[in-house]
């Protein structure tokens, strides 16, 4: 069986301020077991945007219902975009671990650009 890949098909997305951004991500396998997280930026200072395993993220909705056991679509929508949301977003698959899950594979990233509302 081929190793799981995390696919972010869009290199960049342009969204007008106040609109909703859709960031696409799919996994090619259900294995290994473990959650998906979305981050803005890379490295130790990256910002958590959505965590499948924990928490409620009011601005973020998932495109698919992640409670369904065979789901492999981890795309998200971020509402009410502002210029402060610009950046590169990474969809990251974690492998279940003990005590902590371990980062397994990251998508290539999607750059979100925000167009100012026309005055």
């Amino acid at each position: 069986e081929e190793e799981l890949q995390v696919i972010q098909p869009d290199k960049s997305v342009l969204v007008a301020a106040g609109e909703t951004a859709t960031l696409r991500c799919t996994a090619t396998s259900l294995i290994p077991v473990g959650p998906i997280q979305w981050f803005r930026g890379a490295g130790p200072g990256r910002e958590l945007i959505y965590n499948q395993k924990e928490g409620h993220f009011p601005r973020v909705t998932t495109v698919s219902d992640l409670t369904k056991r065979n789901n492999m679509d981890f795309s998200i929508r971020i509402g009410n975009i502002t210029p402060a949301d610009a950046g590169t977003y990474y969809c990251v698959k974690f492998r279940k671990g003990s005590p902590d899950d371990v980062e397994f594979k990251s998508g290539a990233g999607t750059e979100l650009s925000v167009r100012a509302k026309p005055s």
């Epitope: 395993k53 924990e54 409620h56 219902d65 409670t67 003990s98």
Partner: antibody
Amino acid sequence: EVQLVESGGGLVQPGRSLKLSCLASGFTFSDYGMIWVRQAPGKGLEWVASISSSSSYIYYADTVKGRFTISRENAKNTLFLHMTSLRSEDTALYYCARRYYGFNYPFDYWGQGVMVTVSS
Amino acid sequence: DTVLTQSPALAVSLGQRVTISCGASKSVRTYMHWYQQKSGQQPKLLIYSASNLEAGVPSRFSGSGSGTDFTLTIDPVEADDIANYYCQQSNEPPYTFGAGTKLELK
């Protein structure tokens, strides 16, 4: 076999405190969010509090906010509910339940419940 | 908060089809779950995320709906199904339950 066993209930006077425990077995406790739900005698189900797998995210019902504290010890497979300033309306059967992964997931296993009676 | 409205009771005959409804005060997308509670027992998950049958639950139970209107269907009803049924949303905090529907025999 998944098991959730609550303990620590009993009769307590208004204004006093009580600490409930829920011992989990048969699954990897640290993978699951945990929830307390209560049911007053003859009434329906009311969510009380929830805690994520690593304790990073905690939520309370408005009716208990500031009085109840949910916590967990993953090393001991145990969930807690520390209840203070108890009121007569807190009288209920308290259930612990587990929730796989994130906020949107359902409560797939429940304990048998422990009775808390607040009365003078 | 998201208020969930259920009819308080339904009288049914064994072998018939019964539909229990749950209305949400605002959209919960598909994050609606159904539980069965028999007298003196803890709740048991039947259906998760509107239409998914939980493992081990008989196929006579089914769920449907999205947004604000949801239904739990039992077809055919058996004696073992006499219980209270609760809907619960997990779209946003706070989690809320419906007041429950009591399934009774005619």
